[in-house]
């Protein structure tokens, strides 16, 4: 987790002087509770946005937006703490909005936004906005939380972000798999414009099960420049196992930008359709 660039972040708006500060996620009001504290945020919304760094790289960011409740507690509102928790790693990053002037009621509901938390593809987060000062130990909570899911690199908008492109998202191998006679599969895919090797991972399954009945790995050496964007054709021999008929072919590239961690593409061949009605068995067996 990190913030997008380190340029001056602003939270000021007409009628409010405000500055954004780094936070330890442990506001002073936890340690020194105040008697009068503001109510919780209202209508917290988290959306996926995209933002460029000063270097021109494009990153997915969490766009956080919330409004204030229209009660007198805004007179005691000194700011807000924004926290993003990555659920899997338990990594947390916080910033603090520090109000440098007192809030006053005005004809429009106060609305705040922040779009500088960089998030990772295919990761899950919990976003919390705490109004400051935080409540006394037994006081009503004055925060609101929401979960937030970032799509993976197959998502159209994500595909062109810098982290996704670094993992090979722009490569479309357009895999085709056909079943040949004599227990073979022909796999065809488009090579990328890089001299790097590929690996084909074949996993076969029985018709209705998820336990594999056959696994095979095939190495494809790095193509020459004249072979870039060309189709590569590979014939794989299957194990002759009755019912081991559903095949998943996965292609793993080893691009220089992502090495062992590149996005894999896969295609599946289903088992042949069984006829709905089995051939009728005659009541009697002819003797001739």
């Amino acid at each position: 987790l990190r913030l997008l660039d380190h340029r001056a972040l602003v939270c000021s708006q007409p009628g409010l002087n405000c500055t954004v500060k780094n936070s330890t996620c442990l506001d002073d009001s936890w340690i020194h509770p105040r008697n009068l504290t503001p109510s919780s945020p209202k209508d917290l919304q988290i959306q996926l946005h995209f933002a460029h760094t000063q270097q021109g790289d494009l990153f997915p960011v969490a766009h956080i937006e919330w409004t204030l409740q229209t009660d007198a507690s805004i007179l005691y509102l000194e700011g807000a703490e924004l926290s993003v928790l990555q659920l899997n790693t338990n990594e947390r990053l916080c910033v603090r909005f520090e109000f440098l002037s007192k809030l006053r009621h005005h004809h429009r509901r106060w609305r705040f936004t922040f779009s500088h938390f960089v998030v990772d593809p295919d990761q899950e987060y919990e976003v919390t906005v705490h109004h400051l000062p935080k409540p006394i130990p037994d006081g009503d909570p004055n925060h609101q939380s929401k979960n937030f899911l970032v799509p993976d690199c197959e998502h159209a908008r994500m595909k062109v972000t810098t982290p996704c492109m670094s993992s090979g998202s722009l490569w479309d191998p357009n895999i085709t798999v056909e079943t040949l006679e004599a227990h073979q599969l022909r796999v065809s895919f488009t090579l990328w414009n890089e001299s790097t090797h590929y690996q084909i991972l074949l996993t076969s399954f029985p018709h209705m099960e998820n336990h594999s009945c056959f696994e095979h790995m095939h190495h494809i050496p790095a193509p020459r420049p004249e072979e870039f964007h060309q189709r590569s054709n590979v014939t794989l021999t299957l194990r002759n196992l009755k019912g081991c008929c559903r095949h998943q072919v996965q292609i793993q590239p080893f691009f220089s930008s992502c090495l062992n961690d590149c996005l894999r593409h896969s295609a599946t061949v289903s088992c042949p359709e069984m006829p709905d009605t089995p051939e009728p068995i005659p009541d009697y067996m002819p003797l001739w």
Epitope: L87, N88, T89, E124, K146, N147, F148
Partner: antibody, heavy 116, light 107 residues
Framework: QVQLVQSGAEVKKPGAAVKVSCKAT????????ISWVRQAPGQGLEWMGW????????KYAQKLQGRVTMTTDTSTSTAYMELRSLRSDDTAVYYC?????????WGQGTLVTVSS | EIVMTQSPATLSVSPGERATLSCRAS??????LAWYQQKPGQAPRLLIY???TRATGIPARFSGSGSGTEFTLTISSLQSEDFAVYSC?????????FGGGTKVEIK
């Protein structure tokens, strides 16, 4: 090929405990959390909680708090869910699933029957 | 906790027809909603997340829409393999909760 393979069916007496395992293959266990979801016969799905193999952090459904423990063993890429003080209404198919909010891969399920 | 209500409980549709399934949340869950398909004796399978984004490998005949409290899963032209139970799930807040499911059966 991402796969979550669970341990076999169990029959337990009321008051006993059950420990269901879930072995992850085709990806690194620490890259994503593992969630547990159960389904009583003829009923809908019920979220039980999750564990992060990366941080060890857990989050449990309130109604199971104190009875459920989720653990992982990264050396064997296996997640475990233990449920104690079993009751007849714990009879269900227990699923492990990858991730903590939305579940993109599921185990095949483990039927736990609680009966005296 | 957020209660998810699905309707109808059972939907009878002929192959090739369109199926429209509904899911309602007891409070706003923004777009934090997923749909799953489950066939008898099998684990659920993720179809849609973010209310409208198809999961990897899911055919285009499945589409999701809605935000806030009202959501819809549409199967544009039912295939034989689509007859199953469909469940919605909110992941906006803890605890995560599922709807009771809609069974799509052959008419």
């Amino acid at each position: 090929q991402v796969q979550l393979v669970q341990s076999g069916a169990e029959v337990k007496k009321p008051g006993a405990a059950v420990k269901v395992s879930c072995k992850a293959t085709g990806y690194t266990l620490t890259s994503y959390g593992i969630s547990w979801v159960r389904q009583a016969p003829g009923q809908g799905l019920e979220w039980m909680g999750w564990i992060s193999a990366y941080s060890g952090n857990t989050k449990y459904a309130q109604k199971l708090q104190g009875r459920v423990t989720m653990t992982t063993d990264t050396s064997t890429s296996t997640a475990y869910m233990e449920l104690r003080s079993l009751r007849s209404d714990d009879t269900a198919v227990y699923y492990c699933a990858r991730k903590q909010l939305v579940f993109d891969y599921w185990g095949q399920g483990t039927l736990v029957t609680v009966s005296s | 906790e957020i209660v998810m209500t699905q309707s109808p409980a059972t939907l009878s549709v002929s192959p090739g027809e369109r199926a429209t399934l509904s899911c309602r949340a007891s409070q706003s869950v923004s777009s934090n909603l997923a749909w799953y398909q489950q066939k008898p004796g099998q684990a659920p399978r993720l179809l849609i997340y973010g209310a409208s984004t198809r999961a990897t490998g899911i055919p285009a005949r499945f589409s999701g829409s809605g935000s806030g409290t009202e959501f819809t899963l549409t199967i544009s032209s039912l295939q034989s393999e689509d007859f199953a139970v469909y469940s919605c799930q909110q992941y906006d807040n803890w605890p995560l909760t599922f709807g009771g499911g809609t069974k799509v059966e052959i008419k």
